[in-house]
Interface confidence: low
């Protein structure tokens, strides 16, 4: 008994009668009754067949894999298990496809064989400076081939984003994130090679440290304390600027406080603190800024002091300003002593004193010093005598 056809089988029931033709040869005439829908033609059935090309790096030949659900037959027995073997790159091959589920005509499939896989290389073209937030991937042709390059298309899929370009650039990415990009190259819309890359974006710039306070503790000292940024970093750079001079220090990542020494008194210091990370390149975080003015200190000594006689009983005392004022104000003081007695005590804006009405023929000690409003400086001391009156 013949098996019962399934509803999906294209099954034909036929009854046959035999007669003789005038030539005497037997003619079989067949009456066919379709009991289920007729089979499609193989040309129709496989109209939209797709092909994947698999490359053998040893033989440098391709295998075309036919994407069909059943085991098809190919004319001249050119295929096995839905695969057509030993295809040369950039050459056309014609294959006739048939199966017992479809009728003639066969599907004639033109296999347009792609270029060799090793002639393409997926290259990471990300600029190191931008590697924290961008990814660049590019297919490079590293050898020549005879296929028509117009027929080559490139496809990338990174997450849910799809690009049909030879080169892709993903921007505004999160630092320190892994991104997976799958890419394939198609020749006449048939995939022939693919590659996947998992790329981890580089460490991003660290955030800005949070300065808790910065202040001057003394004339030659200052202190700065901070909270570190939340993102990864390697170390800190602390710069301090006075007028046009700039000094920078590299500080250990575990520090949250730094004492500045050997500062100049009564000077404004501008401090900038940033974290940095050594990744593919060094990335500096935003700098946090603060400033302070160091406390006052005694000024240095006035210099180039001169005492000259302007008349028998008058003297002219001059001096040059101190090299370091170290305070807010500017005042010059002159003390004149005879013996151990203070006979004059004058204060001027400039170091230019005219001392009159001194005793004749007397030894005087002249002490000039600078006062900065907070501290007096070391006095410059000169001795000078008045002469006998000339009259």
């Amino acid at each position: 008994q013949s098996p019962t056809p399934s509803p999906t089988d294209a099954y034909l029931n036929a009854s046959e009668t035999t007669t003789l033709s005038p030539s005497g040869s037997a003619v079989i005439s067949t009456t066919t009754i379709a009991t289920t829908p007729s089979k499609p033609t193989c040309d129709e059935k496989y109209a939209n067949i797709t092909v994947d090309y698999l490359y053998n790096k040893e033989t440098k030949l391709f295998t075309a894999k036919l994407n069909v659900n059943e085991n098809v037959e190919c004319g001249n027995n050119t295929c096995t298990n839905n695969e057509v073997h030993n295809l040369t790159e950039c050459k056309n091959a014609s294959v006739s496809i048939s199966h017992n589920s479809c009728t003639a005509p066969d599907k004639t499939l033109i296999l347009d064989v792609p270029p060799g896989v090793e002639k393409f290389q997926l290259h990471d073209c990300t600029q190191v400076e931008k590697a924290d937030t961008t990814i660049c991937l590019k297919w490079k042709n590293i050898e020549t081939f005879t296929c028509d390059t117009q027929n080559i298309t490139y496809r990338f899929q990174c997450g849910n984003m799809i690009f049909d370009n030879k080169e892709i650039k993903l921007e505004n990415l999160e630092p320190e994130h892994e991104y997976k990009c799958d890419s394939e190259i198609l020749y006449n819309n048939h995939k022939f090679t693919n590659a996947s890359k998992i790329i981890k974006t580089d460490f991003g710039s660290p955030g800005e440290p949070q300065i808790i306070f910065c202040r001057s503790e003394a004339a030659h000292q200052g202190v700065i304390t901070w909270n570190p940024p939340q993102r990864s970093f390697h170390n800190f750079t602390l710069c301090y600027i006075k007028e046009t001079e700039k000094d920078c220090l590299n500080l250990d990542k575990n520090l949250i406080k730094y004492d500045l020494q050997n500062l100049k008194p009564y000077t404004k210091y501008v401090l900038s603190l940033h974290a940095y990370i050594i990744a593919k390149v060094q990335r500096n975080g935003s700098a946090a800024m603060c400033h302070f003015t160091t406390k006052s200190a005694p000024p240095s000594q006035v210099w180039n002091m001169t005492v000259s006689m302007t008349s028998d009983n008058s003297m002219h005392v001059k001096c040059r300003p101190p090299r370091d004022r170290n305070g807010p104000h500017e005042r010059y003081h002159l003390e004149v002593e005879a013996g151990n007695t203070l006979v004059r005590n004058e204060s001027h804006k400039n170091c230019d004193f005219r001392v009159k009405d001194l005793q004749y023929s007397t030894d005087y000690t002249f002490k000039a010093y600078f006062h900065n409003g907070d501290y007096p400086g070391e006095p410059f001391i000169l001795h000078h005598s008045t002469s006998y009156n000339s009259k």
């Epitope: 997450g159 849910n160 505004n172 990415l173 999160e174 939340q230 990864s232």
Partner: antibody, heavy 117, light 112 residues
Framework: GVQLQESGAELARPGASVKMSCKAS????????MQWVKQRPGQGLEWIGY????????KYNQKFKDKVTLTADKSSTTAYMQLSRLTSEDSAVYYC??????????WGQGTSVTVSS | DIVITQDELSNPVTSGESVSISCRSS???????????LNWFLQRPGQSPQLLIY???TRASGVSDRFSGSGSGTDFTLEISRVKAEDVGVYYC?????????FGGGTKLEVK
């Protein structure tokens, strides 16, 4: 202060889609990620995913990746979540929440979605 | 995925007493930066969740000092001292150390 104002309740048929909004105010919209959380009636909280409004980067919980589409409009400081192919399992309250450095610090009042034929 | 487990409270808590709510994680929430990414929320009836504690033990802004968080990498406790009627609701712990972020099933607090 910071506010996340979510759109009103939705009643939808099975198989349909709904799109809800979360209007942010009182802070710089592009400086924080917007998280989305699901809460079924009488149940706990489930994280759906987030969008970074600045870059458009989206991370989904795999469980919701075929259900949910997250978008954000910087100009209107509004985040959106679309639910597609609705089933009764999607009936829930959906919250948007701003993520600070280590926590979800501000939450919307929730949008109730009811799927019923 | 990281699984977060919370226990039920067996009985309502008397106002003025203290209560501990526990939370367990299937994986350590201690991250390489030394921080433990475990947060606690309170969801009062009919309201959105409200952040109480973050990074295991840091109280969120404006949260009463009656709430304190502690724990190790996998076992955590939320302590509420001098419980008040306004503390009723469901308490959730949440991990933020690994995608997908996950919440505990919640612990309901009732006050008598």
């Amino acid at each position: 202060g910071v506010q996340l104002q979510e759109s009103g309740a939705e009643l939808a048929r099975p198989g349909a889609s709904v799109k809800m909004s979360c209007k942010a105010s009182g802070y710089t919209f592009t400086s924080y990620t917007m998280q989305w959380v699901k809460q079924r009636p009488g149940q706990g909280l489930e994280w759906i995913g987030y969008i970074n409004p600045s870059s458009g980067y989206i991370k989904y919980n795999q469980k919701f990746k075929d259900k949910v589409t997250l978008t954000a409009d910087k100009s209107s400081t509004t985040a959106y979540m679309q639910l597609s192919r609705l089933t009764s399992e999607d009936s829930a309250v959906y919250y948007c929440a701003r993520r600070g450095s280590y926590f979800f610090d501000f939450w919307g009042q929730g949008t109730s979605v009811t799927v019923s034929s | 995925d990281i699984v977060i487990t919370q226990d039920e409270l067996s009985n309502p808590v008397t106002s003025g007493e203290s209560v501990s709510i526990s939370c367990r994680s299937s994986k350590s929430l201690l991250y390489k930066d030394g921080k433990t990414y475990l947060n606690w929320f309170l969801q009062r009836p009919g309201q959105s969740p409200q952040l109480l504690i973050y990074l295991m033990s840091t109280r969120a802004s404006g949260v009463s000092d009656r709430f304190s968080g502690s724990g190790s990498g996998t076992d955590f406790t939320l302590e509420i001292s001098r419980v008040k009627a306004e503390d009723v609701g469901v308490y959730y712990c949440q991990q933020l150390v690994e995608y997908p972020f996950t919440f505990g099933g919640g612990t309901k607090l009732e006050v008598k």
